[in-house]
């Protein structure tokens, strides 16, 4: 019962994770105009991994793609790879882990198949959860190190008589959503990595028996089962945790005055 | 069609406060910001302040202690009170309608305040 | 607070002739997110609310005649009339949208000679 409430809340904790790294990835929000100690403007900037919006007190709000994949900077390419990395693998583990749940039985699916689409599954939602953790905090590097470069020429000076208005940005709301989602999918692995555990077909453990052969003992005990990631058969007693390959696989347009979001 | 009209007392005396109405018509307030701008006769323009979408408001850092622009949107209406006015205040009112740029595309015809004891 | 310059204070012009006002800010009007110049242009005829021209410093308003043109960046602007009509007799205003207050130029009269 607690193996399947373990694996059932994992589950649930990794879909909701997984949920917040596709809505942290889609929002606008990754870097917001900063407003503190700065001249109060008509108009807020904030930037997200796809386009850029502006929003003019008037409550027109004008965003603009990036158009260019080749002029973007390689951080943000990254950040994206990672993001997109984070949700391919987590909806494949979300996949798996519908069928591996212990309350859904599916023709004669034993538990040790189960128990290795749980690891499967667990694992997956762990490397997903840190690339989105990775993309988040690879962008928030970003931003601090362009905040200070910002605040070191805030204003700067045209003929010593003319002021420009340095536009600085910090944290936006994606970051954060990022920064928890990416975590709860990683506790959700976590949880199902435990949940495979528990998962194992029972099997009938003796003690420790001594076996006395002429000519020299051989103390056997038979260890207990270890799940391996494939969805084949098991061998019994392997003890290998194969956690498997992971890969990174992975237009400027001005508006008119009725394109507006 | 769009309309603005401003309303209110003509006369004020000094060291009252003065309060103007805005009432529109042929668009909402959820979706359009408004601002106030006056102009003392034979002057140029001086904006006051606006009220946006959601109720937050913005005003002049000169007027800013006196100055409390409200609405209401059922009423499709926008106060502007000016509290301690003075014979400098005498000017024409203006509301208008903030759009794209943060300009103001429509004007209301403006009410003549002049503060006078 | 950014103070607006206009110049001439006064324009005389013949019909038909091209008519320039200048507009200069004391801070740039120039926003890095989307590269666009928060200056407005209006027009204000004796008797009458101001009307909006050009905002975003060179986007004509719907309505407005093509021979109004706006154009500039940072902390100057420009707005020109191509062709002199009777009808744009007025007092010409331009507007900082950028940074609060949203103070107004002094306006510069244009007048027909």
């Known amino acids: 019962m607690a193996v399947t409430a373990c694996q059932g809340l994992g589950f649930v904790v990794s879909l909701i994770g997984i949920a917040g790294i596709i809505a942290a990835t889609c929002m606008d929000q990754w870097s917001t105009q900063d407003l503190y100690n700065n001249p109060v403007t008509a108009v807020f900037n904030y930037q997200g991994l796809w386009r850029s919006c502006v929003r003019e007190s008037s409550g027109f709000t004008e965003c603009r793609g990036y158009f260019t994949l080749l002029g973007l900077p390689a951080m943000l390419q990254a950040v994206r790879a990672l993001m997109i990395v984070g949700i391919v693998l987590g909806a494949i583990g979300l996949l798996v882990s519908i069928f591996a749940l212990k309350c859904i039985r599916i023709g004669s699916m034993e538990d040790s198949a189960k128990a290795n689409m749980t690891l499967t599954s667990g694992i997956m939602f762990i490397v997903s959860g840190l690339c989105a953790i990775a993309g988040v905090s690879v962008f928030a590097n970003m931003l601090v190190t362009n905040f200070w470069m910002s605040t070191a020429n805030m204003y700067t000076g045209m003929g010593g008589m003319v002021q420009t208005v340095q536009t600085r940005y910090t944290f936006g709301a994606a970051l954060f959503v990022g920064w928890v989602a990416g975590g709860l999918t990683l506790i959700g692995g976590v949880m199902m990595c435990i949940a495979c555990r528990g998962l194992a077909p029972e099997e009938t453990n003796y003690k420790a028996v001594s076996y006395h052969a002429s000519g020299h003992s051989v103390a056997y005990k038979p260890g207990g089962f270890k799940a391996s990631t494939g969805f084949g058969s098991n061998t019994k007693n392997k003890k290998i945790y194969d956690g498997g390959a992971r890969t990174e696989d992975e237009v400027q347009s001005y508006p008119s005055k009725h394109d507006y979001v | 069609q769009v309309q603005l009209q401003e309303s209110g007392p003509g006369l004020v005396k000094p060291s009252e406060t003065l309060s103007l109405t805005c009432t529109v018509s042929g668009f909402s307030l959820t979706s359009y910001a408004i601002s106030w701008v006056r102009q003392p006769p034979g002057k140029g323009l001086e904006w006051i302040g606006e009220?946006?979408?959601?109720?937050?408001?913005n005003y002049n850092s000169s007027l800013k202690s006196r100055v409390t622009i409200s609405k209401d949107n059922s009423k499709s209406q926008v106060s502007l009170k000016l509290s301690s006015v003075q014979a400098a205040d005498t000017a024409r009112y203006y509301c208008?309608?903030?759009?794209?740029?943060?300009?103001?595309?429509?004007w209301g015809q403006g009410t003549l305040v002049t503060v006078s004891s | 607070d950014i103070v607006m310059t206009q110049s001439p204070d006064s324009l005389t012009v013949s019909l038909g002739e091209r008519a320039t006002i200048n507009c200069k800010s004391s801070?740039?009007?120039?926003?890095?997110?989307?590269?666009?110049?928060?200056l407005t242009w209006y027009q204000q005829k004796p008797g009458q609310p101001p009307k909006l021209l050009i905002y975003w410093a060179s986007t004509r308003e719907s309505g407005v005649p093509d021979r109004f043109t706006g154009s500039g960046s940072g902390t100057d602007f420009t707005l020109t009339i191509s062709s002199l009509q009777a009808e744009d007799v007025a007092v010409y205003y331009c507007?900082?949208?950028?940074?609060?207050?949203?103070?107004f130029g002094p306006g510069t009269k244009l007048e027909i000679k």
């Open positions: 801070q740039s009007l120039l926003n890095s997110g989307n590269q666009k110049n928060y």
């Open positions: 507007q900082n949208n950028f940074i609060y207050p949203l103070t």
């Open positions: 009220i946006w979408t959601g109720g937050g408001t």
């Open positions: 208008g309608r903030l759009s794209y740029g943060n300009s103001l595309d429509y």
